[in-house]
């Protein structure tokens, strides 16, 4: 029986010689479970596994804990790859996280974290980040130290409010914190003064809702 090649992430895909951006099947670490992911093979040398994308408001991001755990949407468009896969992957080796942002005026910016991982579900997929560089603010718009993940049905934030219900979307909310890339999608000319929009405070401030976002990860040693 011919042995099937499995890919753990998009860096594996790239190293195998498949260097065209697109959707590839990835396998969970130490498992046969599979997931489909969009691989960006062009940005900064390629090998990036896309874990989130917002671009047109076509997908509802006000989802349950289980949906954020397993992922939703279409990897070629708006989607969330899934906390469980990302957690398992980023605990195998060191990963970097790149967040690419676009505003409605045609400007682009990014934040790059030199070390990123998510705790297991037992610890509510808490985010861990180190070493920020980039053009989307000198201060991290993801609260440091990292917070637990919250969704509309799992209130793990540090507010006497319920951040996920109020701001919409699942995120690593503080009280409620300087970012939420899974907030409500607002079209152009309706995207200001919106506290529940797609926010990256240290680039665009409190009420500005972004046009497009991508979150992607890659092994630090790629």
């Amino acid at each position: 029986k011919e042995e099937q090649i499995t890919f753990r992430d998009c860096a594996d895909v790239f190293r195998s010689g498949l260097t065209t951006s697109g959707i590839y099947t990835l396998t969970f670490p130490n498992s046969t479970e599979e997931t489909k992911a969009y691989c960006d093979m062009e940005t900064g040398g390629g090998g990036w596994t896309t874990i989130q994308r917002r671009e047109d408001g076509s997908v509802d991001f006000q989802r349950t804990w289980k949906e954020y755990k397993v992922g939703f949407g279409n990897p070629s468009g708006e989607h969330w790859l899934g906390n469980e896969f990302v957690s398992q992957l980023t605990n195998q080796q060191r990963y970097v996280l790149k967040i690419h942002l676009r505003d409605w005026e045609g400007n682009e910016a990014y934040s790059l974290y030199e070390h990123f991982y998510l705790s297991s579900e037992e610890f509510n997929y808490r985010i861990h980040l180190k070493g920020l560089t980039g053009t989307a603010g000198k201060i991290s718009s993801i609260s440091q130290p990292g917070n637990d993940f919250s969704t509309k049905d799992a209130d793990n934030d540090k507010c006497i409010c319920k951040c996920s219900q109020m701001l919409t979307g699942g995120w690593w909310f503080d009280a409620c914190g300087p970012s939420n890339l899974n907030g409500m999608y607002y079209p152009q000319r309706q995207n200001t003064n919106k506290f529940n929009g797609i926010k990256w405070y240290y680039w665009k401030g409190s009420g500005y809702s972004l046009k497009a976002t991508t979150m992607m990860i890659r092994p630090a040693d790629f």
């Epitope: 507010c159 006497i160 109020m166 009280a175 003064n193 919106k194 506290f195």
Partner: antibody, heavy 122, light 112 residues
Framework: EVQLVQSGGGVVQPGRSLRLSCAAS????????MHWVRQAPGKGLEWVSY????????YYADSVKGRFTISRDNAKNSLYLQMNSLRAEDTAVYYC???????????????WGQGTLVTVSS | DIVMTQSPLSLPVTPGEPASISCRSS???????????LDWYLQKPGQSPQLLIY???NRASGVPDRFSGSGSGTDFTLKISRVEAEDVGVYYC?????????FGQGTKLEIK
């Protein structure tokens, strides 16, 4: 535990000045907008002033504009209200209050100080 | 400025019975983001006000579920399903949609 501890109240003559302080602890003070709200004896609540997390945005009620100055020192986790040209109608309990949400999202007051009484009388 | 009108101004209630307070605004409080910036506060005797309900209908953490807020636009209601002795005090609605923020006159809830 979030705490807002106020000081600086007292009895003052009309036309004189007073400075109120509000010392914050238990949260990242520099991330929150802060307010002063007052309550005249036996009356309801009246919003007085607001300052954004960085201090770059400031608003006042018409009744105190030009006489009161709100400020903050994020290094000291402290909020202030400088009250000049005080009038009898400024007599009230003054409360400092913290925005419910951080990063200058104005959705109500999640925490309040204990209040400090300012009495303006000759 | 937006005028907030509460009724009744005095509310005597028997413990275990429901209570309802109305709050009307002189202009709509519905923001373009779909939220009503309307909060409810309780000021117990000798204490500072405390947040009960934010954005019209969201209960703050630690607030008993017998408290509920509803309404949109100009008409809002705070309901207490079963009043308890510890609920006595003055209840205020406050709007934050239009600057400056303004409070209602307050409703004094007392036990019969």
């Amino acid at each position: 535990e979030v705490q807002l501890v106020q000081s600086g109240g007292g009895v003052v003559q009309p036309g004189r000045s007073l400075r109120l302080s509000c010392a914050a602890s238990g949260f990242t003070f520099s991330s929150y907008g802060m307010h002063w709200v007052r309550q005249a004896p036996g009356k309801g609540l009246e919003w007085v002033s607001y300052i954004s997390s960085s201090g770059s945005t400031i608003y006042y009620a018409d009744s105190v504009k030009g006489r009161f100055t709100i400020s903050r020192d994020n290094a000291k986790n402290s909020l202030y209200l400088q009250m000049n040209s005080l009038r009898a109608e400024d007599t009230a309990v003054y409360y400092c209050a913290r925005d419910l949400l951080d990063y200058d999202i104005l959705t109500g007051y999640g925490y309040w100080g204990q209040g400090t009484l300012v009495t303006v009388s000759s | 400025d937006i005028v907030m009108t509460q009724s009744p101004l005095s509310l005597p209630v028997t413990p275990g019975e429901p209570a309802s307070i109305s709050c009307r605004s002189s202009q709509s409080l519905l923001h373009s983001n779909g939220y009503n910036y309307l909060d409810w506060y309780l000021q117990k005797p000798g204490q500072s006000p405390q947040l009960l309900i934010y954005l019209g209908s969201n209960r703050a953490s630690g607030v008993p579920d017998r408290f509920s807020g509803s309404g949109s636009g100009t008409d809002f209601t705070l309901k207490i399903s079963r009043v308890e002795a510890e609920d006595v005090g003055v209840y205020y609605c406050m709007q934050g949609t239009h600057w400056p923020p303004t409070f209602g006159q307050g409703t004094k809830l007392e036990i019969k």
